[in-house]
């Protein structure tokens, strides 16, 4: 198999094999390698000399294959808008945010922006789980048979209602979607509201 | 502990291509490059190439393009380096190193393989 | 592409001596971004500096380097028996990367 051409090389149709990795110079009509994640172009190539590509410095980085003769400047994620760091800006990649816990992404451009705080969920309901956290509001959910919660939270789960007998205990009122099931000693006595259905 | 554990020794005939894999363990695997840089017996460092386990990306040393694919599998945290056409020249220990992850710009080598000889003659 | 060129290619020195070694760039190296390795008789490299100047973690303080722009320096202040091995200096601040061709401190 005859060798590919390694850059730089001439295209008169000014297309250059890999798109990714290289680009189309038209002052020469050649086609130069591109900058690899990390570097920048520091000189410019010509007909007899490739790109060449230097580190970027400090505090900024090129995450892509890039013919850029500057760096990006590494951004903080701002905790104003409710934005915490999951990984630092290194050369190659820039500084990793994601939503401060209890909060979901409210705007987004290319990246979240903007985190605004997830709504509370009323008692008998929960968050449903989401794949990613922090991607959306919570849209909330009745708590599934046999299982209750009794706040207003944005992050409380349904518990299984308490049993009992696995306790030694007798039920005195069974639970709902917002409430526990209520558990009495067994030789106690009924409340009074409750002893007249007893006497029946 | 980080570690990168590579498969074992291969030894090839002139215009046959090897498949070298490294393991990775002890850290998150798509977080940083991993790196392929081969020894000649007697010579010095030579680098290769790089894979971005996170995209796939690749970028390869321009002596070894059409000749090299670096490719990985995220669930195993596994990168292979597959050199094709192999000449006796070919000969060496070739190493996969994770690159570094303290300062700024990170192509040097904190984390290396224990290396595979590949060993290339008729 | 930026050549590296260590010297000398072999020192002799006893344990106890200073060593210092050389790499000379062909170009700049940016930002200092110059590491050095040890390496041992069939073992893979070790990281001893980056950033031309910094310990790697678990460097022994007798390990230095110094220097910016085309010439850069290591140097153990005094070698221990298990300094005895190959040193390559890399430069990653223009792509591709490369490194040097190595200088071995041997026994003397």
């Known amino acids: 198999s005859q060798p590919q051409a390694v850059p730089p090389y001439a295209s008169e149709n000014q297309t250059c094999r890999d798109q990714e990795k290289e680009y189309y110079e038209p002052q020469h009509r050649i086609c130069c390698s591109r900058c690899p994640p990390g570097t920048y172009v520091s000189a410019k190539c010509s007909r007899i000399r490739d790109t060449v590509c230097a580190t970027c410095a400090e505090n900024s980085y090129n995450e892509h294959w890039n013919y850029l003769t500057i760096c990006q400047l590494c951004r903080p994620c701002d905790p104003v808008m409710g934005l915490e760091e999951i990984a630092p800006c290194t050369s190659k990649r820039k500084t990793q945010c994601r939503c401060q816990p209890g909060m979901f992404c409210a705007a987004w451009a290319l990246e979240c922006t903007h985190c605004e705080l997830l709504s509370d969920c009323p008692p008998g309901t929960e968050a449903e789980l989401k794949d990613e956290v922090g991607k959306g509001n919570n849209h909330c959910v009745p708590c599934k048979a046999g299982h209750f919660q009794n706040t207003s939270s944005p992050s409380a789960r349904c518990q299984p209602h308490t049993r009992c007998e696995n306790q030694g205990l007798v039920e005195a009122a069974p639970g709902t979607a917002q409430s526990d099931t209520t558990c009495k000693n067994p030789l106690e006595p009924l409340p009074p509201e409750m002893s007249g259905t007893m006497l029946m | 502990q980080v570690q990168l554990v590579q498969s074992g020794a291969e030894v090839k005939k002139p215009g046959a291509s090897v498949k070298v894999s490294c393991k990775a363990s002890g850290y998150t695997f798509t977080g940083d490059y991993m790196y392929w840089v081969r020894q000649a017996p007697g010579q010095g460092l030579e680098w290769m190439g790089w894979i971005n386990p996170n995209s796939g990306g690749t970028n390869y040393a321009k002596k070894f393009q059409g000749r090299v694919t670096m490719t990985r599998d995220t669930s195993i945290s596994t990168a292979y380096m597959e050199l094709s056409r192999l000449r006796s020249d070919d000969t060496a220990v070739y190493y996969c190193?994770?690159?570094?992850?303290?300062?700024?710009?990170?192509?040097?080598?904190?984390?290396w393989g224990q290396g595979t000889l590949v060993t290339v003659f008729s | 592409e930026i050549v590296l060129t260590q010297s000398p290619g072999t020192l002799s020195l006893s344990p106890g001596e200073r060593a210092t070694l050389s790499c000379r760039a062909s170009q700049s190296v940016s930002s200092s971004f110059l590491a050095w390795y040890q390496q041992k008789l069939g073992q893979a490299p070790r990281l001893l500096m980056y950033g031309a100047s910094r310990r790697a973690t678990g460097i022994p303080d007798r390990f230095s380097g110094s220097g910016s722009g085309t010439d850069f320096t290591l140097t153990i202040s005094r070698l221990e028996p298990e300094d005895f091995a190959v040193y390559y200096c890399?430069?990653?601040?223009?792509?591709?990367?490369?490194f040097g061709g190595g200088t071995k401190v041997e026994i003397k």
């Open positions: 190193a994770r690159e570094g992850s303290s300062g700024w710009s990170a192509e040097y080598f904190q984390h």
């Open positions: 890399q430069q990653y601040g223009t792509s591709p990367l490369s």
